[in-house]
């Protein structure tokens, strides 16, 4: 029975005489008068078994002590740690020539664990052991026993086990403890790869190459390898494993992403919070589920927020010219959180007086620049039929519109072709400019082509470049545009509408608001 003693993690003990409770029972030769088993107290007052011999008076001593059979356990090199005391020959009277201060250490490999006798010629000498510290009579009186520790190694071993032997040639020795161990590189995890307990190589310079296995929920990036050195230390880690999608490294293991987190790929990244408008309800998510009404396009990365279709375009304006129509609109108020917005035009030919009787316009109608996938907010439609009612729908679409198409994403206008619209207005004037307003006036078109029902003023900040414009409608030939920003350049266009539709816009009039009121007359080109 052996008690537990704590040794380094990279040492595996095969024999520890201090852990044996009861007699060791090793074989001595001669059976009497040589090595003798004696029980002593250690520093913690625990009884330990020792072997002692002190035949220093008699010449030609040859006392052998052999351990029981020691299993090799696959080790190719073992280490022998001997703790012993040795009497100083100079402190013993009348022993000159017979007293020695060394002993010899031997081993013998054998597959037989029950050899009963010591055959000296079978044993191979490991080394002669000398004491670094010997003790004298004075030391005994003071109870100071100087303990020596010597370690020797032997290998390569190949048989199932071996015996150790100690040869005394006339010294005064006490073997306090004998420990036999081999070294291993202990089980470890590096770079998410687990490397097993590995016994060191046969010689003191050998390196044992070991392939690691990826920990749970991880996969190889490069083949993980390490080398087990002779001293039981792992060296030179090569390669690594990466946590699978839905998992992250935490304290050397791959743990599932928490609820509300995700990881899309096998990388060394940590899990990330679900992007806006998405969630995960289970641990280990590789992507997050979009909130209701939100979607992810096929080519959207898992890291992108979930988005929704855009709202309808704004401020749709139509301009009929006989059998052609120009349409113009503003971007939707809500783009759904995406940049990939475009516009589709739907043309419907409708029966007079019954808007429900509409059918597609067919392939004879032409669109410039195109009918679908428009990136600009303008389109010209030509080759329409004369004297016909048409309804045009402008649909705002983005990368997720196909998942939830809705009429809320379109705006429509109905026009009648083949009636001449009014000509454009030739002269627009700025009558008064203040900090916050511009008073405009204009002439009737040269060719009204009917009764002018109203005028439409379109204006925008110059540096906004028509991206965000406003519309004001009036029946008079003048209007005050209020609510402007001071010291800001604005561009104004005016057009007339008759029953036939809108005419073309006038040339732009550029006006900069003032810091103080002033009365000026513009000429339709530029005014400051």
């Amino acid at each position: 029975v052996t008690g537990s003693r704590v040794y380094p993690a990279n040492e595996v003990t095969l024999l520890d005489s201090r852990s044996v409770q009861g007699e060791l029972g090793w074989i001595a030769s001669p059976l009497e008068g040589g090595w003798e088993e004696v029980s002593i107290m250690d520093e913690k007052n625990t009884p330990i078994r020792t072997y002692q011999v002190c035949n220093v008076m008699e010449p030609s001593q040859n006392n052998w002590l052999r351990t029981d059979w020691i299993t090799r356990e696959g080790a190719q090199r073992v280490y022998i740690e001997i703790k012993f005391t040795l009497r100083d020959c100079n402190s013993l009277p009348g022993v000159m020539g017979t007293c020695k201060e060394t002993f010899n250490l031997y081993y013998y490999e054998s597959d037989n664990d029950k050899e009963r006798f010591i055959r000296e010629n079978q044993f191979v000498k490991i080394d002669t052991i000398a004491a670094d510290e010997s003790f004298t009579q004075v030391d005994i009186g003071d109870r100071i026993m100087k303990l020596n520790t010597e370690i020797r190694d032997v290998g390569p071993l190949s048989k199932k086990g071996f015996y150790l032997a100690f040869q005394d040639v006339g010294a005064c020795i006490a073997l306090v403890s004998v420990r036999v161990f081999y070294k291993k590189c202990p089980l470890t995890v590096r770079n998410l790869a687990q490397f097993p307990d590995t016994i060191t190589g046969a010689d003191t310079s050998s390196l044992v190459e070991v392939r690691g296995s990826c920990v749970n929920n991880s996969e190889e990036k490069d083949v993980p390898k390490m080398y087990c050195g002779a001293d039981g230390e792992w060296l030179v880690p090569i390669g690594n494993c990466l946590c699978n999608a839905g998992h992250e490294e935490r304290s050397g293991e791959c743990q599932a992403c928490k609820i509300g987190y995700y990881k899309a790929l096998s990388t060394d990244a940590t899990c990330a919070k679900c992007p806006p408008h998405s969630y995960s309800v289970w641990e280990g998510a590789t992507s997050c589920t979009c909130d209701r009404g939100f979607f992810r396009a096929d080519n959207d990365a898992a890291s992108m927020p979930c988005t929704r279709p855009p709202s309808a375009p704004l401020n749709l304006i139509s301009n009929v010219n006989e059998t052609s129509v120009n349409l113009e609109w503003s971007s939707p108020q809500n783009t759904g959180g995406r940049q990939d917005i475009s516009y589709n035009v739907v043309c419907k030919k409708c029966g007079a007086g019954d808007p429900s009787k509409c059918r597609p316009c067919g392939s004879g109608v032409h669109y410039t620049p195109q009918q679908n996938g428009l990136k600009t907010t303008k389109v010209s439609i030509t080759d329409l039929l004369a004297h016909t009612n048409y309804t045009f729908e402008i649909w705002a679409v983005n990368g997720v519109s196909k998942y939830n198409p809705s009429p809320d994403q379109s705006v429509s206008v109905t026009v009648t072709t083949n009636q001449a619209a009014p000509s454009s207005i030739a002269l627009v004037q700025a009558k008064e400019v203040t900090r916050y307003s511009v008073a405009l006036a204009w002439l009737e078109p040269d060719r009204p082509n009917g009764v002018i029902l109203e005028y439409e003023v379109k204006y925008y900040e110059k540096d906004q470049n028509e991206r965000s414009y406003r519309i004001v409608r009036t029946a008079a030939r003048n209007t005050d545009i209020k609510g402007l920003n001071p010291l800001t350049s604005y561009v104004f266009h005016v057009r007339a509408r008759t029953a036939a539709g809108y005419g073309d816009f006038s040339e732009p009039l550029e006006v900069t608001t003032n810091t103080v009121p002033s009365r000026i007359i513009g000429d339709g080109a530029n005014s400051t």
């Epitope: 749970n216 935490r250 293991e253 743990q255 928490k258 509300g260 940590t270 990330a272 919070k273 641990e283």
Partner: antibody, heavy 115, light 109 residues
């Protein structure tokens, strides 16, 4: 769902002491569990964690001084060689499954180390 | 290991008032937002108030508000009540380690 610590008492320096946290209403196979301590009149100090896999991780200052282990319904904290500086109330706490932090705490158990 | 610093060890305000508690991390917390706030009263375990920097824990009044990201975080308590007198701790997570701030005592006058 609740946690309760036990095992706190007066010990002499160097005498190992094991505290136990008993869980009810949830499974230790589903949650990571931490130990936190608080010296009298002082702030909170995180000691370490035992993951649901059974692996452990300790704060740098706590390595070698504490050992965390678990059974199916309890989590133990062993103070390997207590010193007077280890006098504190010891809390066990459950790590949330939805954020990095503790969402359930026990009431604590007092350990006094004195010669 | 990351260090969390709560600059004020004590703050005070009158009932109905507002207090702000700061927590500064020596390095960005995990995901820039894995920071929680706890309230602790004498003889009791800590109570979770805020998680992931700004999410209100279940049953916690909306008077408690967490904000911040990366290394700078704030807990704001408005409409202060007598029951809010306690010590408040921030807790951050980074690279396997949890770290508590030193704590800030709130005194309600």
């Amino acid at each position: 769902q609740s946690l309760e610590e036990s095992g706190g008492r007066l010990v002499t320096p160097g005498t190992p002491l094991t505290l136990t946290c008993t869980v009810s209403g949830f499974s230790l196979s589903s949650y990571h569990m931490s130990w936190v301590r608080q010296a009298p009149g002082k702030g909170l100090e995180w000691i370490g964690i035992i993951y649901r896999s059974g692996n452990t991780y300790y704060a740098n200052w706590a390595k070698g001084r504490f050992t965390i282990s678990k059974t199916s319904t309890t989590v133990d904290l062993k103070i390997t060689s207590p010193t007077t500086e280890d006098t504190a109330t010891y809390f066990c706490a459950r790590e949330s499954s939805t954020f990095y932090g503790m969402d359930l705490w026990g009431p604590g158990t007092l350990v006094t180390v004195s010669s | 290991d990351p260090v969390l610093t709560q600059t004020a060890s004590s703050v005070s305000a009158a009932v109905g008032g507002t207090v702000t508690i700061n927590c500064q991390a020596s390095q960005s917390v995990y995901g820039n937002n894995e920071l929680a706030w706890y309230q602790q009263k004498p003889g009791q375990p800590p109570k979770l108030l805020i998680y992931t920097a700004s999410s209100l824990a279940s049953g916690v009044p909306s008077r408690f508000k967490g904000s911040g990201s990366g290394t700078e975080f704030t807990l704001t308590i408005s409409d202060l009540e007598c029951a809010d007198a306690a010590t408040y701790y921030c807790l951050g997570y980074k690279s396997d380690d949890y770290t508590f701030g030193g704590g800030t005592e709130v005194v309600v006058k």
